[in-house]
């Protein structure tokens, strides 16, 4: 049941608008997307929320909302406002949220905003604002959130921001700002989030972020920075930093030494060639570090004090060795990707007890010693492809109970140790041309996918006999002769629906996969028989 007051409230609901009580004896009025060209006239004085967004309102008269002293949220987004006159919001003493985004404003409506002392959130995004008058926010002492993104600003309106000491979040993204001067945000000591992405910023004053003592999130992504933003050094509370998609070529020594609270750093899509060895020290909250293609890095980084790293990717560099103590610095590491480097010798990773995935493909590794991967009880995936591994200690994999994927393809192996590998589901040995011996399927009861150097080695996994069984399955119900079957196997007849030979063979392979418990490649076929061509030993 509604109280007598709510009946009175609903009688003040403009035509076609949707109105409902807000639970505090005040009224929420939704007049959005009604094609209105002017403000409705018969609004209840008890309105607390008014949504006029997505209409065709092109102008506001002075004092168009008289007596709405309880109004807390006014939405005028998505209209055709080019100008807002002085007095447009007069008397809105309780206004906390004002949404003016997606209009055609060319400058911040200074006079209209004066004395909105309760205003906490102001959206001016997606307009055509190119000018922010110096005193435009001077009366907005309670403002917490300010959106100025997707406008036409070419510089930071530093004077206008001086009065916003309570501001907590601001976005200036998607503008045309090219430089951030020293002390640009000098009075914004409460600011927690600052978005500057998608501008044209090419230079930063060395003290441009001074004063932002509460800042936790800084987004400089998609700009034109060609130097590392050393100005971040005063941001001692910074937790999330983005400067990806810029033109930064190097990250200096001790780059983040002033930002010990960093949890996330996004810096991909920069042409980074060099990284100071101490750049990522003393970041105890950092969990992930990814750096691809920094070709001038020759030494593994010193990660002292960054002990909670869980994922480290450092690919495409020129690292030739790892410190023996690498795992002492990184006891919580779960993923290690050092592919495409010049590693020759490996330390023992056994202190990295939490490692689940190691990728060392495309290096220069020549030997796997007994202690290299000892006791990595959580290791599930190990990629050692495209190295020069000729020697693997017989017990190198003997204490890896969780290992299910092992890739040793394109190495120089002539033998392969099976101890400890009974849990494998994926094994790749292709490209080891000296590895000619057969591997027994009995040693790999869980195997689902195996890639061998030679087709005949797949016969040990039942591929050959199954091929015939499958063929017979295909032929059940038709009158094909065994001779036809052999023609099919040899791919010597035209498949139905005029599919070409290649398509047919692909289908053949897919059906094999479906019916085999083990998918082995290269699978034996007419051009890859189950025979070892080198010594003529016939299996089939």
């Amino acid at each position: 049941g509604s109280s007598p007051r709510s009946g009175v409230l609903l009688r003040g609901c403009p035509t076609h608008c949707h109105c409902e009580p807000d639970g505090r004896m005040l009224l929420r009025v939704d007049c959005s997307d009604l094609g209105l060209s002017e403000l409705p006239s018969n609004l209840s004085v008890f309105t607390s929320y008014l949504d006029l967004s997505m209409n065709n309102i092109s102008q506001l008269l002075p004092n168009p909302l008289p007596s709405l002293r309880f109004l807390e949220e006014l939405r005028l987004a998505g209209n055709a406002l080019t100008y807002i006159p002085k007095g447009a919001f007069t008397g809105l003493y309780s206004l906390k949220v004002l949404m003016l985004q997606n209009n055609q404003l060319r400058h911040v409506p200074t006079e209209a905003l004066q004395n909105l002392r309760s205003l906490q959130s102001l959206r001016l995004d997606a307009n055509h604002i190119s000018y922010v008058p110096p005193s435009c926010f001077s009366g907005l002492h309670s403002l917490r959130h300010l959106w100025l993104d997707d406008n036409a600003l070419t510089e930071i309106p530093v004077q206008a921001f001086r009065s916003l000491s309570a501001l907590q979040a601001m976005t200036l993204a998607l503008n045309k700002i090219h430089h951030i001067p020293d002390y640009a945000f000098g009075n914004l000591s409460s600011l927690v989030v600052l978005h500057l992405h998608n501008n044209r910023i090419h230079s930063l004053g060395k003290k441009c972020f001074d004063g932002l003592h509460s800042l936790e999130t800084l987004d400089l992504n998609y700009n034109n920075l060609d130097e590392f933003p050393t100005a971040i050094r005063t941001l001692s509370n910074l937790k999330e930093l983005g400067f990806h998609s810029n033109n930064i070529r190097s990250i200096p020594e001790k780059a983040f030494v002033g930002n010990p609270s960093l949890i996330t750093i996004h810096f991909y899509d920069n042409p980074i060639q060099f990284v100071g060895r101490s750049a990522f020290q003393h970041l105890p909250e950092l969990r992930t570090l990814t750096l691809n293609g920094a070709s001038q890095i020759t030494e593994f980084p010193d990660l002292t004090g960054t002990a909670n790293l869980e994922s480290l990717t450092l690919t495409g560099a020129q690292i030739s060795s790892l410190p023996q103590t690498v795992c002492n610095q990184l006891p919580n590491l779960q993923v290690l990707d050092l592919s495409y480097n010049l590693l020759e010798d490996l330390p023992s990773f056994s202190v990295c007890q939490k490692l689940q995935k190691i990728d060392l493909r495309h290096n220069e590794i020549y030997e796997i010693k007994v202690d290299t991967f000892q006791q990595l009880l959580s290791l599930r995936s190990l990629n050692l492809a495209w190295n020069k591994i000729a020697i693997i200690h017989p017990n190198a994999f003997s204490t890896l109970p969780s290992l299910i994927k092992l890739d040793l393809s394109s190495n120089l192996l002539s033998s392969f140790p099976i101890t400890g590998l009974h849990g494998l589901t994926h094994l790749k040995l292709t490209g080891n041309h000296a590895l000619q011996s057969l591997i027994s399927s009995e040693n790999f009861p869980e195997l689902k996918v195996i890639e061998m150097p030679y087709a005949y080695q797949c016969c040990a996994f039942g591929v050959c006999e199954n091929a015939y069984k499958i063929s017979n399955q295909w032929n059940k119900g038709d009158n094909s002769s065994m001779d036809d079957l052999h023609k099919k196997d040899a791919g010597m007849f035209q498949a139905q629906d005029e599919r070409d030979l290649e398509d047919f063979l692909l289908d053949f392979e897919e059906d094999l996969k479906a019916l085999h418990s083990v998918q082995c490649s290269p699978s034996p076929g007419p051009f890859k028989p189950c025979e070892h061509l080198l010594d003529g030993w016939l299996i089939r």
Epitope: Y183, G186, D210, H213, T234, G258
Partner: antibody
Framework: EVQLVQSGAEVKKPGESLRISCKGS????????IEWVRQAPGKGLEWIGE????????NYNEKFKGHVTISADKSISTAYLQWSSLKASDTAVYYC???????????WGQGTLVTVSS | DIVLTQSPASLAVSPGQRATITCRAS??????????MHWYQQKPGQPPKLLIY???NLESGVPDRFSGSGSGTDFTLTINPVEANDAATYYC?????????FGGGTKLEIK
């Protein structure tokens, strides 16, 4: 309450070395620049340089570069100004100050009098 | 370096009167809408104390008898009305450019 407490007065001979200190408290020591300013007897104020303790970044007045070294130990919230070879002209009161809004020097230490005389 | 010239070097003002100190810079200290001029008060045997930052912003706890104005190269510190304990030396300082520099000081005496 923000406080900067400087070490006591020093009397030295020309050519001697010296390090004076400035200990900060009541705020995040690593997040604000510490500046050093000198005041020769009966004279005005001269800016020597500054350090951001969180990053060891320093900026010097060219006039003093090479003659003094500014450093900090953030583990004990202390900044230092040191000389390897003092001159008589180094006689002055040396102040440390913490930066404030827009690079102003918002908080000052009580000063350290350094007297260099043979 | 930017040279700051203060005038007068000294002045004597009666309590209740207005004191005006000017500071002229050898080049503009304006940058992107901010004028990087600050004012300090120093009493004998004490460190300087920040009065006004960024030309006209009163530091917390400083009485509003103190005010600052100016832009570019010409700046003014005004004390109105002057009180007896305002006797001190006043310095302007710029940090638009390193090295930051101070004016020579203006000594205010109370009649």
């Amino acid at each position: 309450e923000v406080q900067l407490v400087q070490s006591g007065a020093e009397v030295k001979k020309p050519g001697e070395s010296l390090r004076i200190s400035c200990k900060g408290s009541g705020y995040s020591f690593t997040a604000y620049w510490i500046e050093w300013v000198r005041q020769a007897p009966g004279k005005g104020l001269e800016w020597i340089g500054e350090i951001l303790p969180g990053s060891d970044s320093t900026n010097y007045n060219e006039k003093f570069k090479g003659h003094v070294t500014i450093s900090a130990d953030k583990s004990i919230s202390t900044a230092y100004l040191q000389w390897s070879s003092l001159k008589a002209s180094d006689t002055a009161v040396y102040y440390c100050a913490r930066s404030g809004y827009y690079g102003s020097s918002q908080y000052w230490g009580q000063g350290t009098l350094v007297t260099v005389s043979s | 370096d930017i040279v700051l010239t203060q005038s007068p070097a000294s002045l004597a003002v009666s309590p209740g009167q207005r004191a005006t100190i000017t500071c002229r810079a050898s080049e503009s200290v304006d940058s992107y809408g901010n004028s990087f001029m600050h004012w300090y008060q120093q009493k004998p045997g004490q460190p300087p104390k920040l009065l006004i930052y960024l030309t006209s912003n009163l530091e917390s706890g400083v009485p509003d008898r103190f005010s600052g104005s100016g832009s570019g190269t010409d700046f003014t510190l005004t004390i109105n009305p002057v009180e007896a304990n305002d006797a001190a030396t006043y310095y302007c300082q710029q940090n638009a450019e390193d090295p930051r520099t101070f004016g020579g000081g203006t000594k205010l005496e109370i009649k």
